[in-house]
Each structure stands twice: as structure tokens, then as C-alpha cells.
Interface confidence: low
């Protein structure tokens, strides 16, 4: 029987700048039952705080709801484990929320070909921001990423976007069928998840681009 | 319950001066951009501009840009406007308005009366 | 700046009838649109966001629809609380910018 195994904060993450949870690797446990703490402060401030969210985010997670969570100040954090042997501390954290955000994917993604009389035909790509994103309060640059492939090929295709929320796309393989996905983040965060595929037959005399 | 309460409005000369107060409560003030919007008598709505929740970053609207200027206290819960170089054109009703994820919140309004 | 046209400027109602008001950006605004109601002497309440996300305690009786350029607003069954003025409001980039209004009036 030992005291615990130093714990590990290992990421935390925001969806929209708002909340965030951060989520704890457990070290050893000892052998004996232990209890785990994420304790923090603003940086400037002295004054500890507990998590103030043990659910929300799932085992070994503390979540800060919108009244913990400013925008412009690093939270310094660190999570105590317990047993009856002792105490054992992770490393300081240092979280900046502006640096953990990441959106859920981008939503209403619509594609169809185009083919115009007088121009080349091409696939149309159009698509919403996550609905969490509050892109009035000018908190965020959502920038954009669209992954396509022939539905049997291995490889992806990747075009950035940066922010339109619409795309073209010239070449392409007649006949064929494809998924087609967008992901998001905002300039400082991270990429969202792709979003679900969208599939699309592309006609036999689609005429692929010179 | 989101309030927000305005005031500082009244009479002022054309180049004069006011300086317009917005009191919040019921939401966390700090996270939140907070915005101006007016409505000049029997026209409709008019965005003036906004400040970052740290108070860091303001946009204006090319109207009132380097005349207006918006400012916040946090500690206080409090927004401000405020109106240099008056014109005939500025009188309206002035509104405060939190932008938050579902929507905005508004404020009853402050009259502002801009006429020599 | 992006400028919002809206029609009609004013239209005349009955209780019970669908209404349905257009709003027109100038250029792309993807979906971020808000739709408010304001009546006399009061100050503008937010019905929709983000072209047709409902803002909470808003009757269903209100829906938005549009991407890009073009939306709606349309009122399914009006009650008679729900004769004022119709303004919608874009946020994609400074200056935000709103419609000049959509008066609905008793018929």
C-alpha cells in the first residue's frame, strides 16, 4: 500500500470560449481507494478555488461553467491525489481559454454539381458555422477544411477553405461517387471533428478541369 | 433575470457633449461583449458599436468613429458611451444590449436630444 | 458596409392569418442573421438567431429560414400580440447592420 501515482492533466478544451473542461490521467492508485481535487487560480490572484464541476465533463473531469470562465485571464490548475497513504500532485497546468477552443463541426453541409452552360462544371460545396459559435461578439476567426474522396479510395483530398463557408471544386472523376466532409477552428484552437459525410454522384460527363 | 438599465440622456447643444451609463445584472458582465444600438424618433435601428469583455477592442460604425467612444468598468458592471462633437443627426433613443450565445438582451433606453 | 433590404416596408393583418416578412443581404452573410420584434416605446426583443435558431420562450408560432443572401421570417398564425415592427439584423462583419423594418399593422 502507497501513497497515489502523480496525476496528469492531460487536455482541456472549449467549445466556444464560454466553458471549458479539463480531464486528469490518474496515476497509481496505491492499492487503496483515492480521491482526486483539481484546485486553481486566476493568474495575478492568490486566492485558491476548487473545480467547481466534477460531472459534467465525465470521470477524472472538472468543467467551469460561464460564471468561471474569463477570456482574458490564464487559469494556473493542479489536481491532488488522496489516500489514506498520502498526497501526490500533478504539474501546474497554465490554461489560457482562448488557446483551447475546439468547435463542434460545422453544420448544414450541402453539396451538388453545378454545370454551368458557359464554364466548366463543378461540385459546390456550402455549409453552416456551428451553431455554439457566437460569431457576433467578434471572438472568433472560424477557419474551414474540406475533405473529399471517391467513395473506394483510400486517400483524402484536402482544400482549406480559410473563412468562406461555400467552395468549388473543378476537378473530379466522372462517374463517380463521393464523401464529402468539412471541419472547423477558430485561428488560435483547435480542428473540430469532420462533420458527417455528405455523399454525391458525380454525372458521367462531368468534363474533369485542363 | 437579465437587466440592463440606461441612463445620461437628455438635452444637449450641437458639439456638446454626454456621457451615457448602462448598469448591469443577472449575467456574468465580465464575459461578454456589450453593444450600443439608437433609434432616431419614428426611424428604425442604428448599431453604433461594441467593446471586447476586457474592454481591449472597440468597433464603431464610420458615423460616429472619433467621436463616440465606448468604455467599460467590470468591477462595476457598468458600460458607457461616450458622446463628443454632438450633431442634430445623433438624437435618438440609445440602447445598451448584452450579445449572448441565444440572442441579445436590450435595456429600456436612454432618449438623447441633440438641438440648440 | 453590407446593407439589409427588407418587404414589404409595412403590411396590413388579421388574427389567424400566416405572415411573411423578406430580408435581403447585399452579400453573402452565411447564417448570421437575427430577427427582432419591437412595438411602440419599448426596446427590440430578440425572436431568432442565427437565421432559424428560436430564442428561448419565443411562441413556435415564429419560425426563420434562409442562408446566404436571402431569409425569412414568418409568423404561422398571428395572435394579436404579435402586431409591431419586424426588424432583422446581420452580424457577419462591422458595421452590424439591420433592416429598415417591417411594420405589421391590423387590417
Known amino acids: 500500500q502507497l501513497p497515489p501515482g502523480k496525476p496528469e492533466i492531460f487536455k482541456c478544451r472549449s467549445p466556444n470560449k464560454e466553458t471549458f473542461t479539463c480531464w486528469w490521467r490518474p496515476g497509481t492508485d496505491g492499492g487503496l481507494p483515492t480521491n482526486y481535487s483539481l484546485t486553481y487560480h486566476r493568474e495575478g490572484e492568490t486566492l485558491m478555488h476548487e473545480c467547481p464541476d466534477y460531472i459534467t465533463g465525465g470521470p477524472n473531469s472538472c468543467h467551469f461553467g460561464k460564471q468561471y470562465t474569463s477570456m482574458w485571464r490564464t487559469y494556473i490548475m493542479m489536481v491532488n491525489a488522496t489516500n489514506q497513504m498520502g498526497s501526490s500532485f500533478s504539474d501546474e497546468l497554465y490554461v489560457d481559454v482562448t488557446y483551447i477552443v475546439q468547435p463542434d463541426p460545422p453544420l448544414e453541409l450541402a453539396v451538388e454539381v453545378k454545370q454551368p452552360e458557359d464554364r466548366k462544371p463543378y461540385l459546390w460545396i456550402k455549409w453552416s458555422p456551428p451553431t455554439l459559435i457566437d460569431l457576433k461578439t467578434g471572438w472568433f476567426t472560424l477557419l474551414y477544411e474540406i475533405r473529399l474522396k471517391p467513395e473506394k479510395a483510400a486517400e483524402w483530398e484536402i482544400h482549406f477553405a480559410g473563412q468562406q463557408t461555400e467552395f468549388k471544386i473543378l476537378s473530379l472523376h466522372p462517374g463517380q461517387k463521393y464523401l464529402v466532409q468539412v471541419r472547423c477552428k477558430p485561428d488560435h484552437g483547435y480542428w473540430s471533428a469532420w462533420s458527417p459525410a455528405t455523399f454525391i454522384q458525380i454525372p458521367s460527363d462531368f468534363t474533369m478541369n485542363d | 433575470e437579465v437587466q440592463l438599465v440606461e441612463s445620461g440622456g437628455g438635452l444637449a447643444q450641437p458639439g456638446g457633449s454626454l456621457r451615457l451609463s448602462c448598469v448591469a445584472s443577472?449575467?456574468?458582465?465580465?464575459?461578454?461583449?456589450m453593444s450600443w444600438v439608437r433609434q432616431a424618433p419614428g426611424k428604425g435601428l442604428d448599431w453604433v458599436g461594441n467593446i471586447k469583455q476586457d474592454g481591449s477592442e472597440q468597433n464603431y460604425v464610420d458615423s460616429v468613429r472619433g467621436r463616440f467612444t465606448i468604455s467599460r468598468d467590470n468591477a462595476k458592471n457598468s458600460l458607457f458611451l461616450q458622446m463628443n462633437s454632438l450633431r442634430a443627426e445623433d438624437t435618438g433613443v440609445y440602447y445598451c444590449a448584452t450579445l449572448l450565445t441565444k440572442g441579445d438582451y436590450w435595456g429600456q433606453g436612454t432618449l438623447v436630444t441633440v438641438s440648440s | 458596409d453590407i446593407q439589409m433590404t427588407q418587404s414589404p416596408s409595412s403590411l396590413s393583418a388579421s388574427v389567424g392569418d400566416s405572415v411573411t416578412i423578406t430580408c435581403r443581404a447585399s452579400?453573402?452573410?452565411?447564417?448570421?442573421l437575427d430577427w427582432f420584434q419591437q412595438k411602440p416605446g419599448k426596446a427590440p426583443k430578440s425572436l431568432i438567431y442565427?437565421?432559424?435558431i428560436l430564442q428561448g420562450g419565443v411562441p413556435s408560432r415564429f419560425s426563420g429560414s434562409g442562408y446566404g443572401t436571402d431569409f425569412t421570417l414568418t409568423i404561422s398564425s398571428l395572435q394579436p400580440e404579435d402586431f409591431a415592427t419586424y426588424y432583422c439584423?446581420?452580424?457577419?462583419?462591422?458595421?452590424?447592420?439591420f433592416g429598415p423594418g417591417t411594420k405589421v399593422d391590423i387590417k
Open positions: 442565427a437565421a432559424s
Open positions: 443577472g449575467f456574468t458582465f465580465s464575459t461578454y461583449w
Open positions: 439584423r446581420q452580424y457577419k462583419t462591422y458595421p452590424f447592420t
Open positions: 452579400q453573402d452573410i452565411s447564417n448570421y
